[in-house]
């Protein structure tokens, strides 16, 4: 029940924020109109209208970024609990530690904000619908990939090393990382891990990255990959690569050979179909359908303490 209350509170908060933005926009519009009248030139008015449209567009983009960030969150948009509430300390994952509710964003088409609201969901749906039109064109281009099975081999999972991490300038719960993934230039990655991993533990950390999600802006910062984490409603842990891994090492799956897509087509929801079969097993080893995330010749990827947990 407490969870439901929290969700409802957040919904109300989002509603209030939306009202404030609308009010602010109304004020801006009227100010611009007054200004145009005062200056009394058609040319100036036209210029202001263009400016106003730009502002609106910018706001729309920001809204969409927020929304997309959350669509991509793995959140499943807070389905209201229908089952019996459970005591999390009973899990076979003996050492799952209770902690507060959780947010892990990263990038691409499936950020990891764990915990979204109904407003966010609606907004996400809008974005997805808009995206659908554009993607119809892309579909024919990507059509050749249709014959490929939808399994983990489609994902470009690689070892990365976080070179630097800093707080996102405009979002308290997000980090912005520069990550070496074995390419010429590092990739910028936005992750919602602020409430789960201290900043100093992010520096020079080896991580597993999903590299072929469509890059997405996260509160104004373009995120080019997603940090893979073991995740439960209580806790998030960054998955750890095996010792001896180096940036750029590929994660492979014995039973699922195949080359990853260059970029996952968001329209086809490939990540969304694969993600439910990603779990840590009883030994905290990251797996797809029970097959370990493996760096050939070096070992498997693990969570620190979270067994039988989802991966996002």
């Amino acid at each position: 029940m407490a969870n439901n209350d929290a969700v409802l509170k957040r919904l109300e908060q989002k509603g209030a924020e939306a009202d404030q933005i609308i009010e602010y926009l109304k004020q801006q519009v009227s100010l611009l109109k007054e200004k145009a009248i005062l200056q009394a030139t058609l040319r100036e008015e036209k210029k202001l209208r263009v400016e106003n449209a730009k502002l609106k567009k910018e706001i729309e983009e920001l809204k969409q970024e927020l929304i997309q960030a959350e669509i991509q969150n793995g959140v499943k948009q807070i389905p209201f609990p229908s089952g019996t509430p459970l005591h999390a300390n009973s899990m076979v994952s003996e050492n799952v530690i209770q902690s507060t509710a959780v947010t892990t964003v990263s990038s691409g088409t499936k950020e990891q904000i764990k915990g979204g609201t109904g407003d966010e969901k609606k907004a996400k749906e809008k974005i997805e619908k808009k995206g659908e039109k554009k993607e119809k064109k892309q579909q024919s281009i990507a059509g050749s990939a249709d014959s490929k099975p939808i399994d983990v081999s489609r994902l470009d999972l690689r070892i990365g090393c976080i070179i630097t991490a800093r707080k996102h300038p405009d979002a308290d719960s997000l980090y912005v990382e520069e990550v070496d993934v074995g390419e010429i230039a590092p990739r910028t990655v936005v992750s919602g891990l602020v409430n789960h991993v201290p900043l100093e533990q992010m520096q020079n950390r080896m991580v597993i990255l999903l590299c072929n999600l469509k890059p997405a802006k996260m509160r104004g910062v373009l995120s080019q990959a997603m940090v893979m984490c073991a995740s439960s409603p209580e806790k998030i842990e960054i998955l750890a690569p095996p010792n001896g891994s180096v940036p750029g090492d590929r994660i492979t799956f014995d039973a699922f050979p195949g080359e990853p897509d260059k970029e996952l087509n968001p329209k086809k929801k490939i990540w969304e179909q694969i993600q439910p079969d990603l779990h840590t097993n009883d030994e905290c080893v990251a797996t797809y359908k029970g097959v370990p995330f493996e760096v050939k010749g070096k070992g498997v990827c693990r969570a620190q303490t979270m067994s039988n947990s989802g991966i996002k």
């Epitope: 509430p85 899990m91 003996e94 797996t287």
Partner: antibody, heavy 118, light 112 residues
Framework: AVHLVESGGGFVQPTESLKISCAAS????????MYWVRQAPGKGLEWVAR??????????YYADSVKGRFTISRDDSKSMVYLQMDNLKTEDTAMYYC?????????WGQGVMVTVSS | DIVMTQGALPNPVPSGESASITCQSS???????????LNWYLQRPGQSPHLLIY???TRASGVSDRLSGSGSGTDFTLKISSVEAEDVGVYYC?????????FGSGTKLEIK
């Protein structure tokens, strides 16, 4: 192919000891938790013990019915798991299976029979 | 400990008909993650058990789509549609939410 082969079963008297073994091949043994499950003649399955991997400090877990009498151990260099059974009771008579599972992939040995009788 | 209780089948089941095996747990196996920590195993006569279903409803590799798992937090059903000879054996449910891991007493499926 994955193989789990149990050995060391046999006939013992109550209060005596016995150590059964399981040799694993065909998968990365050191990454897998290992379990012993038993089945008394004509009865259902009963979980007995579990041992975790080195990164999880080889933590062990036991069913209440065997706690203090049975000890599970492993040797990753030999891909072996063992069950040391002390102070055996007649109700420990069962087929003992060595097993490991990871979602889609679960592996069971053919079982080894342990009979405790006076 | 979590107690798993299995129901009996009206044996034998006519070939080609469907069979539903039920299992009840003394405590909800639905975790806050939304996953239900329940496995189904089949032990064919003279063989070791093998996994059919995990997370209550996910079929393991190579398991026929005639088998499906469903349920709530405490009441579970394994449905076998169009029963065949290869389905004969004892079916066990098992919880893996907490230790000790516990199995149901088993449900025997025989074919007419």
């Amino acid at each position: 192919a994955v193989h789990l082969v149990e050995s060391g079963g046999g006939f013992v008297q109550p209060t005596e000891s016995l150590k059964i073994s399981c040799a694993a091949s065909g998968f990365t043994f050191s990454d897998a938790a290992m379990y012993w499950v038993r089945q008394a003649p004509g009865k259902g399955l009963e979980w007995v013990a579990r041992i975790r991997t080195k990164p999880n400090n080889y933590a062990t877990y036991y069913a209440d019915s065997v706690k203090g009498r049975f000890t599970i151990s492993r040797d990753d260099s030999k891909s072996m798991v063992y069950l040391q059974m002390d102070n055996l009771k007649t109700e420990d008579t069962a087929m003992y299976y060595c097993t490991s599972w990871s979602y889609d992939f679960d592996y069971w040995g053919q079982g080894v029979m342990v009979t405790v009788s006076s | 400990d979590i107690v798993m209780t299995q129901g009996a089948l009206p044996n034998p089941v006519p070939s080609g008909e469907s069979a539903s095996i039920t299992c009840q747990s003394s405590k909800s196996l639905l975790h806050s993650s939304g996953k239900t920590y329940l496995n189904w195993y089949l032990q064919r006569p003279g063989q070791s058990p093998h996994l059919l279903i995990y997370w209550m409803s996910t079929r393991a590799s190579g398991v026929s789509d005639r088998l499906s798992g469903s349920g709530s937090g405490t009441d579970f059903t394994l449905k076998i549609s169009s029963v065949e000879a290869e389905d004969v054996g004892v079916y066990y449910c098992q919880q893996f939410l907490e230790y000790p891991l516990t199995f149901g007493s088993g449900t025997k499926l025989e074919i007419k």
